[in-house]
């Protein structure tokens, strides 16, 4: 819950938040996810860094991995065999990307508690994962797949041309990883263990980003990793699959891609398995309006994997591109070849539809003018999933529960009543057979994850409650928030607004514009945090604004295909309408408005600079893309075609920020970017400042030698001191 | 602290059948998950199987369809039915939480000698 206001008298002992309570992270929240084992067991990390099973049955706990163990290799994770023999203890991790990181895996054996001798590990692993049943282990080393039977045994090898930077064997490359699987791992066990599935990703004709990482040496290193730009040629993906019982038999047996999406270029974009003998896998046409889901059968005779056309279903978007961000995964009933997927209704929301047999013939399970988000779990009676249905606000999420047993089906929402000022944000995670679940609140109150029982509901404990932070803020003046909606043009514009603790509607303040506005994203979310805007609100009375555009999610197609093959145009519009407005509420300075933002935020921050409008005194750009051909194919054509002539080349050219440079000259524009970013290259922000130099322009800007997208470490602390300098000169705040 | 009592240990030839049976009393109730393990000569102990307080049952490979385990909550007690005894089942036949807490605590065992 948010400390409740103070006044008069007792307002002296309240103070503001610094920047340094930020940068120390002194106002972080914890958050409590079970580590699920069974119906009615989860694994828990104590404080004290023991592992702890809880029964909740019983109530009981008790230490199965005690902390010096934990100690003695370093471990920083750990993963307990589905058998209950070992656990994986985890160590000298080493971050790659965004997912990936390779480490030093020990097998601890439980029932003797010691460490697996013999047939040990190789290092660094990039990938490893037990069976869903039992102990055999899956690994991938050096872009090769390695299966044990069981710990102590000898590894067997079941690929061998896996290449570094060439072939990719189990685990993604780097397109794959970012912009289609999301995971570290590109490999699937059967849910009986016996059979494993995996990608294969081809980078051998990729062309390679290639950038300096400075270091400690007398000469930099050349960082070289295959990245696909627009237009590029892609990686070339094939799926196989091998009985894991006995690998050596027939060896890895290819999974046939339908024919309608081989014909051209194309991805794979996610595997389900259904059964031990029945694998889902979904593809995609690189211009990505077209995805195929195709559901595969083990044929025993042959030993090889039939995909019938019959068990083909396309989903196509008439109106944009297929899915939200990703195209959505189907989740699978007990009958084992029906469905259920979230996807565009006939009125253009994202809903749950039940597939049988085709998808024509799909029995829509939600509707209305708000989205489906996620399927949580489908039991033998019930569905469990999340929508920010309740009181008609996009920017939160409840969970409910349809009941799939009864007919007509009932919905009740599990969350909406329990602690509604707190909490209007949630998520969940479900134990075996949704026995029991655990929910975690994001806020917009103090954020706290309780227990509760999957048959009636009921709150059994409270997991994590934040009784620190709420007690840390008792003395803190914190910023008021307020989330509303401008009616402009037919188009609805949430936003958020961060005021100044004693905001005094007819003084007027300097506004901060906050943005993101990158296609299916949200920035206007019922979620608490305490950070760097909050710290301008608190103490340097600022007034912090966040607003969704078109091209946002979770509030129809209408809004978020609104941008399809045309970004830049209106998500900056939508920035640029919603500060006219604000002006006209009467407490804003026009003559001190700022826009900020990173990444897809640093251009549209960018380009509304650069509009012409005379509304922004100055801002920031971090990290931002520059021109859409230099991002990554897989994220950039989805929502922008080919960069070729006879596709939308033209809107490529002419949403650069480049050919914008003239427009800088009026406004104060601070340029910042990490040198190692394997993202949003350095060439973006470099060609920027090459145009505004070659225009004449004067800017300011700053670089992180050696540092990625995220400027982590001590660079967050410069950053967010350097960019308060900037803002505050920007304003006429004294320092 | 909880206690627990090994039973039904023998002599038997193989293919042979015995049932053991672990009787549970503390603090600690019978709806913990319970497994049987066993330490054969010169060998390091290993689980044998599993049962979680919901019935669910899980076994190595080596003794997949020739033992059985199972539960009686209201005795507090875990049986371990063993069918088609080969030699390689001679061990020292311990039960125990499901996986072992730490320190783990074992009892006696009971011995189970299968001869040729």
């Known amino acids: 819950l948010r400390p409740s206001r103070v006044h008069n008298s007792e307002e002296n002992t309240m103070r503001a938040l610094t920047l340094k309570d930020i940068l120390n992270g002194t106002f972080s929240y914890k958050t409590f996810f079970p580590n699920w084992i069974s119906g009615q067991e989860y694994l828990h990390q104590s404080a004290d860094n023991n592992i702890v099973l809880y029964n909740i049955e019983t109530g009981q706990s008790y230490t199965i991995l005690s902390n010096r163990t934990m100690k003695s290799v370093n471990a920083s994770n750990y993963g307990l065999s589905p058998d209950r023999q070992f656990v994986y203890l985890e160590s000298d991790y080493s971050k790659l990307w965004r997912y990936s990181y390779t480490a030093t895996y020990y097998i601890y054996d439980l029932s003797n508690g010691e460490f697996v001798r013999g047939n040990e590990l190789p290092r660094p692993i990039q990938y490893l994962c037990w069976s869903p049943v039992g102990s055999k282990l899956a690994y991938v080393y050096q872009n090769n797949i390695y299966l044990k039977q069981r710990p102590g045994d000898p590894p067997f090898q079941i690929t061998f041309n896996g290449r570094e930077n060439k072939i990719f064997n189990g685990i993604p490359d780097w397109v794959y990883e970012e912009e289609m699987l999301a995971t570290k791992y590109a490999l699937w066990w059967s849910p009986n263990g016996k059979f494993l599935a995996y990608a294969e990703f081809n980078d051998t004709d990729i062309p390679v980003i290639a950038y300096s990482y400075y270091g400690d040496e007398q000469y930099p290193r050349t960082i070289n990793i295959p990245y696909p730009k627009a237009g590029a040629k892609n990686p070339v993906v094939r799926i196989f699959i091998i009985d894991t019982t006995y690998p050596a038999y027939v060896g890895p047996q290819e999974v046939p891609v339908p024919a309608m999406i081989a014909s051209s270029d194309y991805y794979f974009s996610w595997l389900t398995w259904v059964t031990d003998e029945r694998v889902c896998l979904q593809w995609l046409k690189r211009v990505q309006n077209v995805s195929v889901l195709s559901i595969c059968d083990f044929r025993e005779d042959w030993q090889t994997w039939d995909c019938p056309k019959t068990q083909e279903h396309i989903e196509e978007s008439r109106t944009g591109w297929a899915g939200g961000f990703f195209v959505s995964t189907p989740v699978f009933s007990y009958d084992a070849i029906s469905y259920y997927k979230i996807f565009s209704d006939k009125d253009g929301y994202k809903h749950i539809h039940y597939i049988k047999d085709t998808v024509e013939n799909a029995i829509q399970i939600t509707s209305g003018k708000w989205e489906a988000i996620n399927i949580f779990r489908v039991t033998q009676d019930s569905l469990f999933y999340s929508s920010n249905e309740f009181e008609e606000y996009p920017g939160r999420r409840n969970i409910y529960r349809i009941s799939i047993g009864s007919y007509p089906p009932s919905k009740k929402c599990v969350t909406c009543h329990l602690r509604k000022e707190r909490c209007q944000y949630y998520t969940a995670s479900f134990s075996d057979y949704a026995k029991y679940y655990a929910l975690v609140c994001y806020g917009p109150g103090i954020p706290i994850s309780t227990l509760h029982d999957g048959r009636t509901d009921q709150e059994i404990k409270i997991l994590e409650e934040n009784k620190e932070l709420e007690n840390a803020l008792k003395n803190i003046q914190l910023p008021k928030e307020e989330i509303k909606k401008l009616e402009v043009d037919e188009i609805t514009l949430w936003y958020k607004m961060i005021l100044p603790p004693q905001f005094d509607r007819s003084k007027k303040y300097p506004l901060l514009i906050q943005v993101y506005g990158g296609p299916c994203s949200q920035s206007v979310r019922s979620v608490f945090a305490v950070n760097w805007i909050s710290y301008l609100a608190s103490k340097e009375g600022m007034v912090i604004a966040l607003v969704d555009g078109r091209g946002t999610a979770f509030q129809g197609d209408k809004l978020l295909y609104a941008v399809y093959r045309k970004l830049g145009v209106y998500e900056v519009e939508d920035q640029i309408t919603a500060v006219r407005k604000f002006i006209e509420m009467g407490f804003i300075d026009e003559k001190r408005i700022a826009i900020w933002g990173w990444s897809y935020g640093g251009y549209v921050s960018s380009l509304a600079l650069a509009s012409g409008t005379g509304l922004f005194k100055c801002g920031i750009a971090v990290a931002p893309v520059s021109s859409w051909e230099y991002y990554a194919s897989v994220y950039t054509e989805r929502f922008m075609g080919l960069p070729t002539k006879d596709d939308n080349l033209e809107h490529y050219k002419n949403s650069t920020v480049m050919a914008r440079a003239e427009y800088f000259r009026n406004v104060d524009y601070l340029l910042i970017h990490g040198t190692a970013d394997d993202n949003v290259h350095f060439q973006n922000s470099a060609q920027i400042a090459k145009a505004l130099v070659n225009a004449q322009v004067d800017f300011q800007a700053m670089w992180y030698s050696d540092q990625n997208h995220g400027l982590s470490g001590l660079s967050t602390n410069h950053l967010y001191t350097h960019m308060t300098h900037f803002l505050k000169q920007c304003f006429s705040l004294s320092d | 602290q909880v206690q627990l009592q090994e039973s039904g240990g023998g002599l038997v030839q193989a293919g042979g059948s015995l049932r053991l049976s672990c009787a549970a009393s503390?603090?600690?109730?019978?709806?913990?998950?319970m497994g049987w393990y066993r330490q054969a000569p010169g060998k390091q102990r290993e689980l044998v199987a599993g049962?979680?307080?919901?019935?669910?049952?899980k076994y190595v490979e080596s003794v997949k369809g020739r033992f059985t385990i199972s539960r009686d909550n209201a005795k507090n007690t875990v049986h371990l039915q063993m069918n088609s005894l080969k030699v390689e089942d001679t061990a020292v036949y311990y039960c125990?939480?499901?996986?072992?807490?730490?320190?783990?605590?074992w009892g006696q065992g009971t011995q189970v000698t299968v001869s040729s």
């Open positions: 049962i979680l307080s919901d019935g669910t049952t």
């Open positions: 503390g603090t600690m109730s019978s709806i913990n998950a």
């Open positions: 125990n939480f499901f996986p072992p807490p730490v320190p783990a605590s």
